[in-house]
């Protein structure tokens, strides 16, 4: 008779990153008996889904359940049917519902009930949807790249594969750029945090930490660009908006109601005597970076030391990891490497805006139309919040790593907020030393 | 205020399907939830899923997953579970509830008076 | 699922008594919980829910108290028409469940 494998002892879990512009279904998997150890949780799956946000399935909410089909077919593919039951479904929604609820919770409540229906159906243990707070994304985004960096372990095991030359138990800061919002989180250097909003405090494997972070509502990418619009089309002469953000050769219609459609546009919103505007680029980088320091209102602070908008932030400390739309965008424009220095980024960003539309067309024919045109928008949006925004310098920008995965695992939020919720980080050291991480993998 | 009128008792053969309804009166039927609880003989509650009428979403218990069909008919403002593969154990009486919470808060405020469906060769 | 469980599963007390009955969730359901009455050959009808909110036309001897996983049910002072079996149940996440029910009889 043939010999039958014994079955694996592990373990999965999933979650679904509802964005402002997309969602993304992440399995994770882990030994059954080192739910405790450190850094033994990994990613085994991402499917994209294919559409928007769901904050914009508000009034086809009839639409939800098929467009969540493929991923949770995948995810019934990718997890023995043995382990479906006992398979935890967590769904967090980020600042695109956060708006929404802004407008009305009862919209927000709408689509989130059907989110959890739709869900429901399948084989899984689903733990519900939640728009999960900015501080809770902020904190897991730090928790997840310092979990796979394996800082929370008392002699790391990744010292040898992490590509990142870095200063030993020191905690990695996490930078996460979204579409609707923003977060910067780190463990400042013995700096009392003078806005208690703005402080946490963790005990993670026998260790505390004092942990700063802040979440910028409407400061993410396609809603800063919603913002810069907004306030450019006030005080343009007619219906015509020559923007430096975008390629020579560029035009673009928008339509009026879609620009004062979100919360983030309100304080710029005025009567305008047309209902479209048409966008023709210029191309301009230095022009562009001077539009966007006008959304970061550094004119009053009450601390010490603040970011924008009158928000505390402490002085900058040590290394940090830049994620989500960061690393995609920067990973867009070939400037991840850790030997591109700051001044470099800023000329390369120069020359590619300066570069006419038709040309960028040819040369980066796979690209949607729709993304490609923004890429010169984003790539300043994050030499501005990074240097203007958090007051990192030519020499701090050498501190800044441009993360997309870390030993296979995605850099977000969503592998901390699994942790949490499934209690994998303990508050002090399990007594059994972890095996060396070659035991198990 | 609003009522719940379910359809009358049914015998039914093993391997065959039964279809109750259940016909809201004096208040907004379409935005909240209509789930079906059944009740075996001196049981307790038992939920088997729920519809929005708006939407025409329903979700089941894993349990009865492809087996129970919920629908809702917006112009009659009636909702309707069949039940298909019926056995002896599906001997019960069907409750339908309103879920008078507005979304996604479903707390059962009104119920239907009760269909009794009886399993027998 | 999230497993309710109720107990005891009979409570006998004297008219004019003070019932006390408990409900237990496997997990928290914050504040997501219900209680129902049943009598015999009627529909459970709604008392308590949000755990401590009564329903409208709920006499107020009936109060719920508890969130997380512990919650309950208390009836000051039992009039005759209270005897019958009541039900928990959470609304916090699909499916919802029912606890096993609590028997209130005449002692």
């Known amino acids: 008779t043939q010999n039958k494998a014994l079955p694996e002892n592990v373990k999965y879990g999933i979650v679904l990153d509802a964005g402002s512009s997309h969602t993304s279904l992440y399995i994770y998997k882990w030994p059954a008996e080192k739910e405790n150890d450190t850094g033994v949780v990994h990613q085994v799956e991402e499917c994209r889904v294919k559409g928007p946000g769901i904050s914009k399935f508000v009034q086809k909410v009839n639409e939800i359940g098929i467009y969540l089909t493929d991923c949770m077919e995948r995810a019934r593919e990718v997890i023995p049917r043995s382990q479906h039951q006992e398979t935890p479904v967590y769904l967090g929604a980020t600042a695109g519902m956060r708006l929404l609820r802004m407008e009305s919770e009862e919209l927000a409540d709408r689509v989130l009930d059907v989110v959890e229906r739709s869900l429901s159906n399948y084989p899984f243990d689903f733990q519900g949807a939640r728009i999960i707070t900015g501080q809770e994304e902020g904190a897991y985004g730090w928790i997840t790249i310092n979990y796979l960096l394996g800082k929370f372990s008392q002699k790391t095991r990744w010292f040898s594969i992490v590509p990142y030359e870095t200063n030993n138990q020191e905690t990695f800061g996490a930078l996460d750029l979204g579409g609707a919002s923003t977060q910067v989180t780190f463990v400042p250097q013995n700096q009392t945090i003078e806005s208690p909003d703005n402080a946490l405090q963790f005990r993670l494997y026998g260790k505390d930490y004092n942990v700063y972070t802040h979440s910028f509502l409407c400061y993410g990418k396609d809603q800063a660009l919603w913002q810069k619009l907004a306030k450019d089309i006030q005080v343009a002469s007619n219906e015509i908006l020559r923007d430096p953000c975008f390629h020579p050769g560029y035009k673009k219609v928008v339509n009026v109601s879609d620009l004062y459609k979100t919360p983030c546009t309100k304080r710029f919103e005025k009567k305008l005597p047309f209902d479209q505007f048409r966008i023709q680029g210029t191309g301009d980088y230095e022009q562009c970076h001077q539009s966007i320091l006008e959304l970061f209102n550094t004119s009053y602070c009450p601390y010490s030391q603040c970011a924008f908008n009158g928000i505390f932030l402490p002085p900058l400390q040590g290394d940090f990891g830049a994620f989500s739309a960061f690393y995609f965008v920067m990973k867009f424009l070939n400037l991840t490497s850790e030997k591109v220095s700051q001044e470099k980024v800023t000329e390369m960003m120069k020359k590619f805006c300066a570069q006419p539309w038709e040309e960028i067309k040819t040369s980066y024919a796979g690209v949607k139309e729709k993304y490609l045109s923004e890429y010169c928008f984003s790539g300043t949006y994050i030499l501005s919040l990074l240097l203007q925004g958090y007051h990192f310098t030519a020499d701090s920008w050498e501190h800044i790593h441009f993360i997309g995965k870390i030993q296979g695992s995605d850099a977000g939020w969503t592998l901390g907020y699994m942790l949490n919720l499934t209690n994998m980080i303990p508050a002090e050291q399990p007594l059994s030393t972890p095996l060396s991480h070659s035991t198990y993998v | 205020q609003v009522q719940l009128v379910q359809s009358g008792a049914e015998v039914k053969k093993p391997g065959s399907s039964v279809k109750v309804s259940c016909k809201a009166s004096?208040?907004?039927?379409?935005?909240?939830?209509i789930s079906w609880v059944r009740q075996a003989p001196g049981q307790g509650l038992e939920w088997m899923g729920s519809?929005?009428?708006?939407?025409?979403?329903?979700n089941y218990a894993q349990k009865f997953q492809g087996r129970v069909t919920i629908t809702a008919d917006e112009s009659t403002s009636t909702a309707y579970m069949e039940l298909s593969s019926l056995r002896s154990e599906d001997t019960a009486v069907y409750y339908c509830?309103?879920?008078?919470?507005?979304?996604?808060?479903?707390?059962?405020?009104?119920w239907g008076q009760g269909t009794m469906v009886t399993v027998s060769s | 699922e999230i497993v309710m469980t109720q107990s005891p599963a009979t409570l006998s007390v004297s008219p004019g008594e003070r019932a006390t009955l408990s409900c237990r969730a496997s997990q928290s359901v914050g504040s997501n919980l219900a209680w129902y009455q049943q009598k015999p050959g009627q529909a459970p009808r709604l008392l308590i829910y949000?755990?401590?909110t009564r329903a409208s036309g709920i006499p107020a001897r009936f109060s719920g108290s508890g969130s997380g996983t512990e919650f309950t049910l208390t009836i000051s002072s039992l009039q005759s028409e209270d005897f019958a079996v009541y039900y928990c149940?959470?609304?916090?996440?699909?499916?919802?469940?029912f606890g096993g029910g609590t028997k209130v009889e005449i002692k």
């Open positions: 509830a309103r879920e008078s919470g507005g979304y996604r808060d479903h707390r059962l405020g009104v």
């Open positions: 004096g208040g907004t039927f379409s935005k909240y939830g």
């Open positions: 949000g755990a401590s």
């Open positions: 519809i929005i009428p708006e939407f025409g979403i329903a």
């Open positions: 149940q959470q609304y916090l996440l699909w499916p919802l469940t």
